[in-house]
Amino acid sequence: DSSKWVFEHPETLYAWEGACVWIPCTYRALDGDLESFILFHNPEYNKNTSKFDGTRLYESTKDGKVPSEQKRVQFLGDKNKNCTLSIHPVHLNDSGQLGLRMESKTEKWMERIHLNVSERPFPPHIQLPPEIQESQEVTLTCLLNFSCYGYPIQLQWLLEGVPMRQAAVTSTSLTIKSVFTRSELKFSPQWSHHGKIVTCQLQDADGKFLSNDTVQLNVKHTPKLEIKVTPSDAIVREGDSVTMTCEVSSSNPEYTTVSWLKDGTSLKKQNTFTLNLREVTKDQSGKYCCQVSNDVGPGRSEEVFLQVQYAPEPSTVQILHSPAVEGSQVEFLCMSLANPLPTNYTWYHNGKEMQGRTEEKVHIPKILPWHAGTYSCVAENILGTGQRGPGAELDVQYPPKKVTTVIQNPMPIREGDTVTLSCNYNSSNPSVTRYEWKPHGAWEEPSLGVLKIQNVGWDNTTIACAACNSWCSWASPVALNVQYAPRDVRVRKIKPLSEIHSGNSVSLQCDFSSSHPKEVQFFWEKNGRLLGKESQLNFDSISPEDAGSYSCWVNNSIGQTASKAWTLEVLYAPRRLRVSMSPGDQVMEGKSATLTCESDANPPVSHYTWFDWNNQSLPYHSQKLRLEPVKVQHSGAYWCQGTNSVGKGRSPLSTLTVYYSPETIGRR
């Protein structure tokens, strides 16, 4: 109630001889500050004197002086809230009640604190969880109801007398609520810790033993088992017997059931500590263990690997990369169940032994078409040789091989023929699905791999084909060697280089651009008449009569070809001039007489000149000389001269006779 002083401190403090006591303490006085403080040991109230009797351990006066013998006890408080005390060292006879006599100006109070000082350091107390299971982390607690600033201590954990490796966490409390030192150790006990002694040892600052507490661990765990096998290496041959024994080395609590497992699966009707396997087969190879259960759970022994040895079983071949592309690499793997593992292998390709191949894997660095086929193997171990299995098929894919373009026609091929070609190949994998031809043309392919060229051209020289599967293989081009009649036959003048004049030496050449076969014959023709059989037609001295239309023919075994007609033109001076008279060479005076200068000339006469019987040129220059009216005086001999670019020609004299008319005669 409100008439009480309020104190807070631990109810009892514990220590031992020679240690110290630190008493955390707070208070609140009823009024004002503390004026007087006395620490009694076992105080008793004297009703007569109305004062407390007892040993005074500490006394503070108004002037704050403390007698020198009171140095062992220290008041660490103040005048209004802190009443903390320290006794150092503390003695056995300090046990009992401590009385804190507090006085203020108007109020007094006696506060009692119990002090328990033992002769020797008292042991700490180990606290364990209610149940400990293997591999489950637990916290072990070691608690000592002591802590004092002036007397450092340490708590150490030991397992079977050996310091524990795990790190402990030590904490201290020096509060008005509690005074203690505590060490906590996190620990995952194993089954092997069952029954072991754990110690918490109290030591002074130098590690000197002061006291301890011990507990025996009760670690709940599944049964711990040992498996024994006969024969000890667990390696047997088919038909042998095997015995396995299961021994329980530890179980907490006691075990309840036993079973056996092979490769993790429980074996039926095997519920004893001994497993007998009679006349084992290879199927009984595997990992065996026994399983024993208790309330914690099942425990399993280590596995025993029972190896039932046997000769290799029929082998199979695994091919890495089939189908394989020619030139690539391929690996073969021989798979055969055997125990022990095969030490030697024999490989076969299409039934024939592959020399020098004795390993589980065969690697072919560059696959070729002839590597295709069936690969099989035989495995061998110490117990014998296996059988050859069915093998595996290697498919080697490659472009078509030895592709050729073949001309189906009888030879020779003539221009205009229909030519049939086929594209042949030796082998192909996968099969050929299409063909290509070079050069491209508007040709028909009547069937796969056949090309038909209708009306073959003279200039169809070479053709190549390709046979294609996933790849195309081209054949070497084949020459069609088309035969044809001579082509582009024409007449060409070799000499003279300029125009031909009468009397010149003239050579004409019969040209052609090509002929197959090359052997040819020539023919020259003029107006349907054969002139010669050489490639040239020669005129030593050309005459105007040689002019005309010439053709040459060239023929070979295929046919003949004519040139276009070529006109030979001979230039010559006017010749064969004559003067013709119309209406005749006798004309009556007064009539009209026409003289014509006729000539043969190439080019035609460009200029005429007329002469009379006196060789006097007349003032007329056209082909015709017209006398109208004609006079008797015109009678006489006339001649003409014709001129062209080549030269001049003159006619012989022609006489004109002009006779008198009847009228003139009548007048005479």
Epitope: E326, G327, M354, Q355, G356, E359, V362, H363, I364, P365, K366, L368, P369, W370, H371, Y398, K401
Partner: antibody, heavy 124, light 110 residues
């Protein structure tokens, strides 16, 4: 009968490109399983494989020289070529070409037939 | 790059058996190294003897055989003849390139 014949410039200067030709007869590089390789031998020393080429145009090069080497073939002319760029005196050697073949019925390759070599001197 | 090591020289007598070995610096020689053995006779006359570790090239006498002995490739001449006096080179395949050994000079004392 299989024969191989190497030809080269005989002598060339540092930094030039060495061009070698291997002309062969008795087999074709269009035939499956056929290859031609180049090997050199500096005077008094061992053999150094340079490169080889297979019928299917697969090419392999000595890693230490790869950046300088080019191997090629002309199947129709039965020739294989090797170019070595930026030569120096260390490239002085006898250069051999050899057929590398996988004969019919075999699974591995052989350096079975060799040329007689051509001597190349790199000199400043 | 790997180094391929061979005995520098071996001496034998006619009719004797001699074994040449070929070691790889990268570890054990396996069948995947496709060991090849090549014979060099005077005047740069080279002939391929063995391919793929243990396969004789066509036309090679049966006295030449290839094998793996321990971690090395080996060439055995069973019943050596005087004409077998030569330098023998091995070549090992490393995934994408060959490396030749330094060669073993075999002397057949007649």
């Amino acid at each position: 009968q299989v024969t191989l014949k190497e030809s080269g410039p005989g002598i060339l200067q540092p930094s030039q490109t060495l061009s070698l030709t291997c002309s062969f007869s008795g087999f074709s590089l269009s035939t499956s399983g056929m290859g031609v390789g180049w090997i050199r031998q500096p005077s008094g020393k061992g053999l150094e494989w340079l490169a080889h080429i297979w019928w299917d145009d697969d090419e392999y090069y000595n890693p230490a020289l790869k950046s300088r080497l080019t191997i090629s073939k002309d199947t129709s002319k039965n020739q294989v070529f090797l170019k070595i760029a930026n030569v120096d005196t260390a490239d002085t050697a006898t250069y051999y070409c050899a057929r590398i073949s996988i004969p019919y019925g075999y699974y591995d390759w052989f350096f079975d037939v060799w040329g007689t070599g051509t001597t190349v001197t790199v000199s400043a | 790059q790997a180094v391929v090591t061979q005995e520098s020289a071996l001496t034998t007598s006619p009719g004797e058996t001699v074994t040449l070995t070929c070691r790889s610096s990268t570890g054990a020689v396996t069948t995947r190294n496709y060991a090849n053995w090549v014979q060099e006779k005077p005047d740069h006359l080279f002939t391929g003897l063995i391919g793929g570790t243990n396969n004789r090239a066509p036309g090679v006498p049966a006295r030449f055989s290839g094998s793996l002995i321990g971690d090395k490739a080996a060439l055995t001449i069973t019943g050596a003849q005087t004409e077998d006096e030569a330098i023998y080179f091995c070549a090992l395949w490393y995934s994408n390139h060959f490396i030749f050994g330094s060669g073993t000079k075999v002397t057949v004392l007649g």
